[in-house]
Every structure is written in structure tokens, then in C-alpha cells.
Interface confidence: low
């Protein structure tokens, strides 16, 4: 069978076999090597000799096989814009950024470039528990029934009604959606505003 | 060649507004954020705020946040700042910079600069 | 707010000396600055982007260095076009300015 060709190699047809790692060079009509992740072009290829790549300098990079002649510049998460660093930039790979906690994107452009402040939701709710947190803006959702949740909060969530009966006591007022059930002695008597409600 | 041209001077009278021009040629607008920096008569450079042109998103600084008003217009490809109740602290140089592609932090291109003088 | 500072705020030297202008970042700002050079009556010039990033067309003399909170622009020999004004600017966490060193010969 015939050896695969190696860049450079005449290309009619305007493509070359490897479309990731090739591309075609007009002016030449070849196939010729891309640049690996973490490299750029320093010197393009001609017909007799392939591209030569040479590694990105610091504080830059390429995230992939390229014939881009020069790197990217790294580019910080911006405090101002509500971005953190979840891990730092290498020559292969930009700079990683999330919202900061307590913070959703408000702006997309590929990638976050703005995050705002989640809203707070009221007592008797919670945020919806999202698949990736900072994506989008909380949707409240209602305690479901024997939870409560008793502030204003972007975060707070639901909790479990207090069982007096688990503490040896009994309970003095239900619990709701926005208060946990009171709970008193056994012995105690009940608070007057409560003491008509009980049937003996 | 990407130049920016600023009107060298403008005069305006305390507790009015002053629209101030930066028109890009050499490249489109749409591919920048156009930045705003100031330097009173003999001191530094502060930076004021940027607008992204194809969306008109801006963001100032909070000392600037009710004096400037930024605005970009993509079909003359060019971009405004409008300062209002002028005070004579409003006295200074004002440049435009775009931040392109190929130098996402950093201005290597300025407008000239227009000379705000506020008197009455 | 990281403030940005300039030391010297003058300086004065002669043609052909090495020059060392320092700027100083109130936190770490990862390498994230520019230098400027500005003459009297013009607009600013990009000198050194990314600390150490030599602007096109900008001559070999000048070159930039540091890492952290402290950064350097240095100009190897000293040329009469080179008395001018010269601002650092840090580019993380918002655009700032240093307050600006002055050179002028001797």
C-alpha cells in the first residue's frame, strides 16, 4: 500500500486528510502541520519544508492545534466583574473563572464575563438546587411540606420541621413554611392565645 | 492603520453638558471596547470606564458613574462621552482607546485628546 | 481599590546611562501591566504590555520585568528622545494608573 504522505504534501482538492492537525496553504496548494496546543507558527511552511512551531512565552497560550502566529495573552478573572480563578493559565489553556460565591453570569460571550448577585429568596422558599452552580439566577421554589426556612437568603435552605416528641417534649405551635414548630415542656401550660384551641 | 480622531477642544459652562467624539478609522468599532481616560492639567492618567460597542454595555468607574455617559454609534464608527453638570474639576484632557483583539488590555492606539475647559 | 505606585516621581539622568523606573502594586496583580511613555501635548504611547511584552516598534532599549507586586522599566542607554513621562498601568481587577515618573536629562 502507499505511505501515508507527511506534511507538506500537494493538495488538489483544497483539503488535507487530518483536518485537526493540518490545514491547507493557499498560495503553495499543500497540507501542512498545525501547531500543537501550547505552541504558535514561527515559521510557515513552504512546499520543501513543514511549519515550524515554537512554544508559547509566558503568561500566553493556544488552546489548540493552530497555524496562528502568535499566542494568546492570558487574561486575568476580573474581581470588578464578579470573576474568580478556579485554576491559573498555562500555555495550553486560558485562564479558568467562575462567579464568585453568592454570584450568577449575568453575561455570556463564549464565556462569563459578568456575574451579578444571586437574588435573595424570601422566607418560606429556596433556591431551586441547580446542575452547575453560577449559571443562572436563583428560581425560588416553596418549602415542601413539614421544611421551613425563615430569612432572606440567596443560599439558606429548607429545613427539616423540629419533632418536639424526639426531645421529650410536645409541641406548643405547628411549624409552617416560614417558622419551626415550637416545642415545651410537657408540664408546662400552654400559652394563652393557644389554650382555647386544645381539645381535652 | 487604526487611527482615532478627537476634536481638540471644547468649552463648557458650569452645571451643563459636553458630548465629546471618537471616530475609529482603520478599524470596525464592532471588534473593540472603546475606553475613556482622563488627565487633569498636570497630573496622571485616570481611567473613566469602556462601552462595548455592539451591544452598548457599558461600565464606569464609580466616581464617573452620574458625570459620564458613554454611547457608540457602529455605523460611523464612532463613540461618544457625554459629561453632564460640569464642574471646573471637569477641566482636563479626555482620550479615547480602544482595546483590540490583538492587545485586549492594553491601548496601543489613542485619540489625540479634546480639552474640556469649563467656565462661566 | 489596588493602588498603583511610581518611584521615582523625577528623575534626571544622562544620555547612554541605564535607567530603572519602578512600580509598585498595593496587592498582587499577577503580571498584569503595561507601561506607557507620554510627551509633553501628546497622547500616551504603549511602551511594554504583559509586563515584558515589547509593543511593536518600540525600540530594544526598553524592556520590563517583575512578577507579584513589584515591576520594573528599564531603558539599557539612555537617548534625548526618551525624557518624557512614563506611567505604568495594571490591568487586573479594573484599569489603574500609577501617578507617573518624570525623566528629563541632564
Known amino acids: 500500500s502507499q505511505p501515508q504522505a507527511v506534511p507538506p504534501y500537494a493538495s488538489e482538492n483544497q483539503t488535507c486528510r487530518d483536518q485537526e492537525k493540518e490545514y491547507y496553504e493557499p498560495q503553495h496548494r499543500i497540507c501542512c502541520s498545525r501547531c500543537p496546543p501550547g505552541t504558535y507558527v514561527s515559521a510557515k511552511c513552504s512546499r520543501i519544508r513543514d511549519t515550524v512551531c515554537a512554544t508559547c512565552a509566558e503568561n500566553s497560550y493556544n488552546e489548540h492545534w493552530n497555524y496562528l502566529t502568535i499566542c494568546q495573552l492570558c487574561r486575568p478573572c476580573d474581581p470588578v466583574m464578579g470573576l474568580e480563578e478556579i485554576a491559573p493559565c498555562t500555555s495550553k489553556r486560558k485562564t479558568q473563572c467562575r462567579c464568585q460565591p453568592g454570584m450568577f453570569c449575568a453575561a455570556w460571550a463564549l464565556e462569563c464575563t459578568h456575574c451579578e448577585l444571586l437574588s435573595d429568596c424570601p422566607p418560606g422558599t429556596e433556591a431551586e438546587l441547580k446542575d452547575e452552580v453560577g449559571k443562572g439566577n436563583n428560581h425560588c421554589v416553596p418549602c415542601k411540606a413539614g421544611h421551613f426556612q425563615n430569612t432572606s437568603s440567596p443560599s439558606a435552605r429548607c429545613q427539616p420541621h423540629t419533632r418536639c416528641e424526639n426531645q421529650g417534649l410536645v409541641e406548643a405551635a405547628p411549624g409552617t413554611a416560614q417558622s419551626d414548630t415550637t416545642c415545651k415542656n410537657p408540664l408546662e401550660p400552654l400559652p394563652p392565645e393557644m389554650s382555647g384551641t386544645m381539645l381535652m | 492603520e487604526v487611527q482615532l480622531q478627537q476634536y481638540g477642544a471644547e468649552l463648557g459652562k458650569p452645571g451643563t453638558s459636553v458630548k465629546l467624539s471618537c471616530k475609529v478609522s482603520g478599524y470596525n468599532i464592532g471588534n473593540t471596547y472603546i475606553h475613556w481616560v482622563i488627565q487633569r492639567p498636570g497630573k496622571g492618567l485616570e481611567w473613566i470606564g469602556r462601552i462595548d460597542p455592539t451591544n452598548g454595555n457599558t461600565i464606569c468607574t464609580e466616581k464617573f458613574k452620574n458625570k459620564a455617559t458613554l454611547t457608540a454609534d457602529l455605523s460611523s464608527n464612532t463613540a461618544y462621552m457625554q459629561l453632564s453638570q460640569l464642574k471646573s474639576d471637569d477641566t482636563a484632557i479626555y482620550f479615547c482607546?480602544?482595546?483590540?483583539?490583538?492587545?485586549?488590555?492594553?491601548?496601543?492606539?489613542w485619540g489625540q485628546g479634546t480639552l474640556v475647559t469649563v467656565s462661566s | 481599590d489596588i493602588q498603583m505606585t511610581q518611584s521615582p516621581s523625577q528623575l534626571s539622568a544622562s544620555v547612554g546611562d541605564r535607567v530603572t523606573l519602578s512600580c509598585k502594586a498595593s496587592?498582587?496583580?499577577?503580571?498584569?501591566l503595561n507601561w506607557y511613555q507620554q510627551k509633553l501635548g501628546e497622547a500616551p504611547r504603549l511602551l511594554i504590555y504583559s509586563t515584558n511584552i515589547l509593543q511593536t516598534g518600540i525600540p530594544s532599549r526598553f524592556s520590563g520585568s517583575g512578577s507579584g507586586t513589584d515591576y520594573t522599566l528599564t531603558i539599557s542607554s539612555l537617548q534625548p528622545e526618551d525624557a518624557a513621562t512614563y506611567f505604568c498601568q495594571k490591568y487586573y481587577s479594573g484599569f489603574t494608573f500609577g501617578s507617573g515618573t518624570k525623566l528629563e536629562m541632564k
Open positions: 482607546a480602544p482595546t483590540t483583539l490583538t492587545t485586549p488590555d492594553s491601548f496601543a492606539y
Open positions: 496587592q498582587n496583580i499577577y503580571k498584569y
